[in-house]
Interface confidence: low
C-alpha cells in the first residue's frame, strides 16, 4: 500500500477518506487505527457500528469520528480540532474475525495556522459571530506523499 497524505491546519478539522471495493468488503465492519512505530501494532482509535447495516451512523471516540458508506465503498474519518500530537501514520482497516485488511495507509500532517493573529500585525480584530455552535467539517486536502502543501497564506 502506498501512503496517502492528508493535511490539516491546527485547530481546524480534517476529513480522511478511504475508498474500497464494496463487494469485496461486503458485511465487514471498518476501523481507524494509529500506527505505533514503524513496525509496531496499529492501535484502534474508532470503529464503525457493531451492526454492519448501521455502519452509516457516525461513531465517535473523543475528537475522532467514523462513518461508512457501505454501498458507495467509502470509509470517512473526521478528526476535529486537529492538534500537533495528531500527526502520524494511521490505517483504515476492514475487519473480519480477528483479522484486519488494510484499506489505506494514511499520513496525517498537522500544519500550524499561518493566518495566526500573532503573525499578522494588527490584521486580526474580534469578529462578530451571532451564534457559536458545534459542527462537523467536510474538508481536507489530500495529495501524494511527496507534495507538502500548506492550505493557508502565511502572512509572514
Amino acid at each position: 500500500h502506498n501512503t496517502t497524505v492528508f493535511q490539516g491546519v491546527e485547530g481546524q478539522s480534517l476529513q480522511v477518506s478511504c475508498p474500497y471495493d464494496s463487494m469485496k468488503h461486503w458485511g465487514r465492519r471498518k476501523a481507524w487505527c494509529r500506527q505505533l512505530g514503524e513496525k509496531g501494532p496499529c492501535q484502534r482509535v474508532v470503529s464503525t457500528h457493531n451492526l454492519w447495516l448501521l455502519s452509516f451512523l457516525r461513531r465517535r471516540n473523543g475528537s475522532t469520528a467514523i462513518t461508512d458508506d457501505t454501498l458507495g465503498g467509502t470509509l470517512t474519518i473526521t478528526l476535529r480540532n486537529l492538534q500537533p500530537h495528531d500527526a502520524g501514520f494511521y490505517q483504515c482497516q476492514s475487519l473480519h474475525g480477528s483479522e484486519a485488511d488494510t484499506l489505506r495507509k494514511v499520513l496525517v500532517e498537522v500544519l500550524a495556522d499561518p493566518l495566526d493573529h500573532r503573525d499578522a500585525g494588527d490584521l486580526w480584530v474580534p469578529g462578530e459571530s451571532e451564534s457559536f455552535e458545534d459542527a462537523h467539517v467536510e474538508h481536507s486536502i489530500s495529495r501524494s506523499l511527496l507534495e507538502g502543501e500548506i492550505p493557508f497564506p502565511p502572512t509572514s
Epitope: S13, L115, I150
Partner: antibody, heavy 118, light 112 residues
Framework: EVQLVESGGGLVQPGGSLRLSCAAS????????MSWVRQAPGKGLEWVSV??????????GYNPSVKGRFTISRDNSKNTLYLQMNSLRAEDTAVYYC?????????WGQGTLVTVSS | DIVMTQTPLSLPVTPGEPASISCQSS???????????LNWYLQKPGQSPQLLIY???TRASGVPDRFSGSGSGTDFTLKISRVEAEDVGVYYC?????????FGQGTKVEIK
C-alpha cells in the same frame, strides 16, 4: 454541492449604510474562513475582508481601504455571512462577492451590486 | 501592499493553439515553507471568478490539465496548452502571501 448566494445590494447615497448577506450551503460553515471580494464596474478584483472559523474565534481582517467602515460577521445558526458597510463612498460602488477561503478563494457567490451615488 | 502586474492586458487567441499569460509581483511570493503563494483565477463573461491554480502550479479541483502554472519567486506564467472556446474570459493572478491580498489587473482572453 457548495453554494454561496449573496443579497442586500442596491442603491445608496454617499455616507449611507448597507448590509450584505451571503447564504452558504453544501459545507460545514463554522469550519471555514469566509471572505468578501469586490469588483468595481469594468474593473478588477479587490479583496475586502475575511472572517476566520470557529477554531480561530471568528477573528476578522480588513483591507485598509475599508477598515473602520466595514464590519464582517457571521451567523452560524443560519450559515450566513454578512458585511455591514457604513460611511459608503462612490469608490465603494462594485459587485460584492462572498467567497470561501481555503488555499485560495475556492468557491464564489454570484455577487450583489452595490451602487453608491447621490 | 504587494503589487501584481499582468501582461498582456488583452490576448487574442486561436482555438487549438497555445496561450500564455504573465504575472509579476513586486515582492517574492516564495515562502520559507517552499510554497509560492500565487493563485490564478478565470472570470468567464457574466460569471463569478473561479479558482484555476493555487500555490503557483497546483490545479484546483475540476480544472482541465490544459491549464498549467509555473514561475519563480516574482515572475509567473499561466499556460493553456490548447485553447478552447470556453476558455475566454478575464484571467487574474493573485498573491496569497500577505495581507491585503492583491490581484493583477486582469488579462482578457478572446477568440480571434
Amino acid at each position: 454541492e457548495v453554494q454561496l448566494v449573496e443579497s442586500g445590494g442596491g442603491l445608496v447615497q454617499p455616507g449611507g449604510s448597507l448590509r450584505l448577506s451571503c447564504a452558504a450551503s453544501g459545507f460545514t460553515f463554522t469550519d471555514f474562513y469566509m471572505s468578501w471580494v469586490r469588483q468595481a464596474p469594468g474593473k478588477g478584483l479587490e479583496w475586502v475582508s475575511v472572517i476566520r472559523n470557529k477554531a480561530n474565534a471568528y477573528t476578522a481582517g480588513y483591507n485598509p481601504s475599508v477598515k473602520g467602515r466595514f464590519t464582517i460577521s457571521r451567523d452560524n445558526s443560519k450559515n450566513t455571512l454578512y458585511l455591514q458597510m457604513n460611511s459608503l463612498r462612490a469608490e465603494d460602488t462594485a459587485v460584492y462577492y462572498c467567497a470561501r477561503l481555503t488555499y485560495g478563494f475556492d468557491y464564489w457567490g454570484q455577487g450583489t451590486l452595490v451602487t453608491v451615488s447621490s | 501592499d504587494i503589487v501584481m502586474t499582468q501582461t498582456p492586458l488583452s490576448l487574442p487567441v486561436t482555438p487549438g493553439e497555445p496561450a500564455s499569460i504573465s504575472c509579476q509581483s513586486s515582492k517574492s511570493l516564495l515562502h520559507s515553507t517552499g510554497k509560492t503563494y500565487l493563485n490564478w483565477y478565470l472570470q468567464k463573461p457574466g460569471q463569478s471568478p473561479q479558482l484555476l491554480i493555487y500555490w503557483m502550479s497546483t490545479r484546483a479541483s475540476g480544472v482541465p490539465d490544459r491549464f498549467s502554472g509555473s514561475g519563480s519567486g516574482t515572475d509567473f506564467t499561466l499556460k493553456i496548452s490548447r485553447v478552447e472556446a470556453e476558455d475566454v474570459g478575464v484571467y487574474y493572478c493573485q498573491q496569497f502571501l500577505e495581507y491585503p491580498f492583491t490581484f493583477g489587473q486582469g488579462t482578457k482572453v478572446e477568440i480571434k
